[in-house]
């Protein structure tokens, strides 16, 4: 028998520095977790103790903090090289800065293979990108070889900016021939490493003949056997065992997100490459694991540029940006409008001639807007200003919801109106009218939404049975501020870009902004 240790991360999202337990900015260092310096310590410890170790990343290193905003992927290549990752699969967020934003900082600088079998380049890009990412890589590990085959969410064109010269194929259809090829090369230990979410990971384990292990990402799935060590609730045991269509037991793993855990899976193979046993658990990277001093010193060196960046002007406002709780928790506020407009702008993807865009709607809890920005400071807007408005380090995500769920969400928005509570929704691409004289749960008297399948966007009444795409904060997608109906009833959820980054990019693009209060949210006469 031959034993392999798979260490894995996914959806790190720019958390190079240690974070608080909820993966936001580290405040009390003694209680902080993750970060590349701490990860390095644990990886080195395991590499010294065990013979055949692979360190793999299942995508979405890009996007999530000011580190990515400033360094644009160079930080990913540098620190992943320093940790000596053995392979990485491309995630959807790796395309956030377009193909060039992937090629130059990461693909050309990585000292490890970057993989995806279901992304095919065409046109002029095909020769430019040739060899910079691969469908699979056969890696020597000890005296054996291990085949690693990559995959990426085929929804990437709707979630990021891969351009028109990359085709995202069905994962299973693309993986099978590559795995077959590895088999003909007598590679009998094959890991599928990819970024399509836990449901697809399980499907790959079931359907792709020859895959021995699946290491996934995208859905931030936490798996654990036994008592979990932190706040995350396991979606299943680690590893999650799938019985394949050809009768094999295939372990599937994922390691939550944000570098909080290091996935640790031990696999035992027989001489024919069959999995005999698999066991392990994610390792919580808490403060009991020291940060490596040399990596930490390097982090501190790279940090300097971030501090300078946060005080630079991104653009100007010529109006007061009202982000006060007195406004945003009670009525339409122009800060809410600005943020929602930025959220929609960040999701412009012309992927179908029938649609002007794939999404037109935004909702945003007023309680998530934490500060106004005064225009009397020469109109200057900095990252620092935006960090005061959006201090929680969240993301603006894409969900699919039925109209009936949206209606419930808007009823929840005003179910206890007047108490300055955070659930009051700011909107974009939506016109809502409330009648507060009516009883809670029946206060939405009009709800019109901007069409997407139209050449001239206009507002139409919400249809209860129709499925709509909506951009919203991850906080709401996860049921925050009492929006349990969103969490329970959403049909699809894809994590998006860092909230501050979305707004800062929009302001930089617009150069001068002047958001107004324009009647997106109205109250019917006599009730307000």
């Amino acid at each position: 028998a031959w034993e392999l240790t798979i260490l894995h991360t996914n959806d790190v999202h720019s958390r190079l520095e240690q974070t608080s337990e909820d993966s936001s900015k580290c405040v009390n260092a003694s209680r902080c977790m993750g970060g590349v310096a701490r990860l390095f310590t644990k990886v080195q410890q395991i590499r010294r103790a065990e013979p055949n170790v692979l360190l793999l990343d299942a995508g979405d290193q890009y996007q999530g903090t000011i580190w990515f905003t400033v360094y644009k992927g160079a930080e990913v290549a540098h620190f992943m090289n320093a940790l000596r990752y053995d392979a990485m699969a491309l995630g959807n967020h790796e395309f956030d800065n377009g193909v060039e934003g992937l090629i130059e900082p990461l693909l050309k600088e990585a000292k490890f293979p970057i993989l995806s079998a279901n992304i095919k380049a065409k046109g002029p890009l095909a020769s430019q990108i040739s060899g910079l990412y691969l469908p699979y890589k056969v890696l020597p590990v000890g005296d054996e070889v291990v085949g690693i085959v990559g995959y990426t969410s085929k929804e990437t064109p709707f979630l990021s900016n891969p351009g028109t010269n990359l085709v995202f194929e069905d994962e299973i259809t693309a993986l099978q021939p590559e795995v077959d090829k590895l088999k003909t090369l007598n590679v009998n230990k094959i890991i599928a490493l990819g970024h399509s979410g836990f449901e697809m990971d399980k499907l790959i384990a079931q359907k792709v003949r020859g895959v021995d292990v699946v290491v996934g990402g995208h859905s931030n799935t936490f798996l654990y056997t036994g008592n979990p060590p932190s706040k995350e609730v396991p979606a299943g045991k680690y590893p999650f065992i799938v019985t394949s269509d050809d009768g094999r037991k295939v372990p599937v793993v994922q390691a939550y997100a944000f570098g909080k855990y290091l996935g640790y899976l031990k696999i035992e193979f027989d001489e024919r490459g069959n999995v005999i046993s698999s066991h392990g658990n994610p390792i919580l990277l808490n403060s009991s694991i020291p940060e490596d001093p040399s990596i930490k010193a390097d982090i501190n060196k790279w940090r300097i540029k971030l501090d300078n960046y946060s005080t630079q002007e991104l653009g100007k406002t010529i109006v007061y940006l009202d982000g006060s709780s007195q406004s945003c928790r009670f009525r339409e506020c122009n800060m809410g409008n600005l943020i929602c407009d930025a959220m929609i702008n960040n999701n412009l993807r012309h992927t179908d001639e029938m649609f002007w865009n794939h999404v037109s709607m935004c909702i945003l809890n007023g309680g998530g807007i934490r500060s106004p920005i005064d225009e009397r400071n020469n109109g200057t807007i900095t990252w620092e200003n935006l960090a005061a408005v959006l201090p929680f380090g969240g993301t603006f995500d894409l969900v699919q919801l039925k109209g009936s769920t949206l209606k419930k969400a808007f009823e929840h928005s005003v179910h206890r109106y007047g108490q300055s509570t955070g659930e009051f929704l700011q909107v974009g691409g939506i016109h809502v009218v409330y009648d507060l004289s009516r009883k809670p749960g029946d206060r939405v008297v009009k709800l019109d939404v901007l069409c997407t399948k139209c050449r001239v966007p206009s507002y139409d009444p919400l249809k209860m049975d129709e499925v709509y795409k909506v951009i919203l904060p991850n906080f709401l997608a996860n049921g925050g501020d009492g929006f349990q109906m969103i969490k329970d009833e959403l049909l699809r959820h894809d994590s998006g870009d860092q909230d501050i980054n979305v707004v800062s990019t929009y302001i930089s693009k617009m150069k001068v902004i002047y958001p107004a209060v324009e009647g997106r949210i109205k109250f019917s006469t006599g009730s307000h």
Epitope: R84, S130, G131, L134, V138, P140, D143, L182
Partner: antibody, heavy 122, light 110 residues
Framework: QVQLVESGGGLVQPGRSLRLSCAAS????????MHWVRQAPGKGLEWVSG????????GYADSVKGRFTISRDNAKNSLYLQMNSLRAEDTALYYC???????????????WGQGTMVTVSS | SYELTQPPSASGTPGQRVTISCSGS????????VTWYQNLPGTAPHVVIY???QRPSGVPDRFSGSKSGTSASLAITGLQSEDEADYYC???????????FGGGTKLTVL
């Protein structure tokens, strides 16, 4: 600047041993896989052996398997090739080469030394 | 014997375009990226193309590389006398667990 300097070559009788060394400077040695490549007089390049950044995986050409041993000392920024049971066909200029990455499983070597000559003859 | 097959020689006049082919199998070129080395007489080899088509800094853009299936090729446009050298292709062979080289192509500038 980035440099690889080989040493230890010379004239040796068939069946005897020789140890080649390669001293690296100008780059972080343990960030990279390292290789030995040889070129017999008037012939092409032939890969001899490779070693990953932490010696975790090692490979040899069939022609030297069981006779040659590659090793590295990251603390000393040095790569070695222990050559036993030498044969006339091992006569060649031996180059030390740095890989672009840290796995030995790739064929891109971006830095080469000037080589050390090994002559196996009675 | 070499796992990768190259023509032993190629030639061209100054200013011309020449291509050098490199043929392998599914276990080497078909499975990994190709590197091209230039070996000038009396000097150590150096990379002119890596990852099938990428040019290291300092290598003129007259050099380009491509790969299709189990074959790769190196193209040199606007041939110059200083391009006269031996050229080798190389890649990783998954079945052999070894780096493999082509036999080399001697390029003569007429």
């Amino acid at each position: 600047q980035v440099q690889l300097v080989e040493s230890g070559g010379g004239l040796v009788q068939p069946g005897r041993s020789l140890r080649l060394s390669c001293a690296a400077s100008g780059f972080t040695f343990d960030d990279y896989a390292m290789h030995w490549v040889r070129q017999a007089p008037g012939k092409g390049l032939e890969w001899v052996s490779g070693i990953s950044w932490n010696s975790g995986s090692i490979g040899y050409a069939d022609s030297v398997k069981g006779r040659f041993t590659i090793s590295r000392d990251n603390a000393k920024n040095s790569l070695y090739l222990q050559m036993n049971s030498l044969r006339a066909e091992d006569t060649a200029l031996y180059y030390c080469a740095k890989a672009r990455g840290y796995s030995y499983g790739e064929g891109a070597f971006d830095i080469w030394g000037q080589g050390t000559m090994v002559t196996v003859s009675s | 014997s070499y796992e990768l097959t190259q023509p032993p020689s190629a030639s061209g006049t100054p200013g011309q375009r020449v291509t050098i082919s490199c043929s392998g199998s599914s276990s080497n070129i078909g499975s990994d990226t190709v590197t091209w080395y230039q070996n000038l007489p009396g000097t150590a080899p150096h990379v002119v193309i890596y990852s099938n088509s990428q040019r290291p800094s300092g290598v003129p853009d007259r050099f380009s590389g491509s790969k299709s299936g189990t074959s790769a090729s190196l193209a040199i446009t606007g041939l110059q006398s200083e391009d006269e050298a031996d050229y080798y292709c190389a890649t990783w062979d998954a079945s052999l667990k070894a780096v493999v080289f082509g036999g080399g192509t001697k390029l003569t500038v007429l």
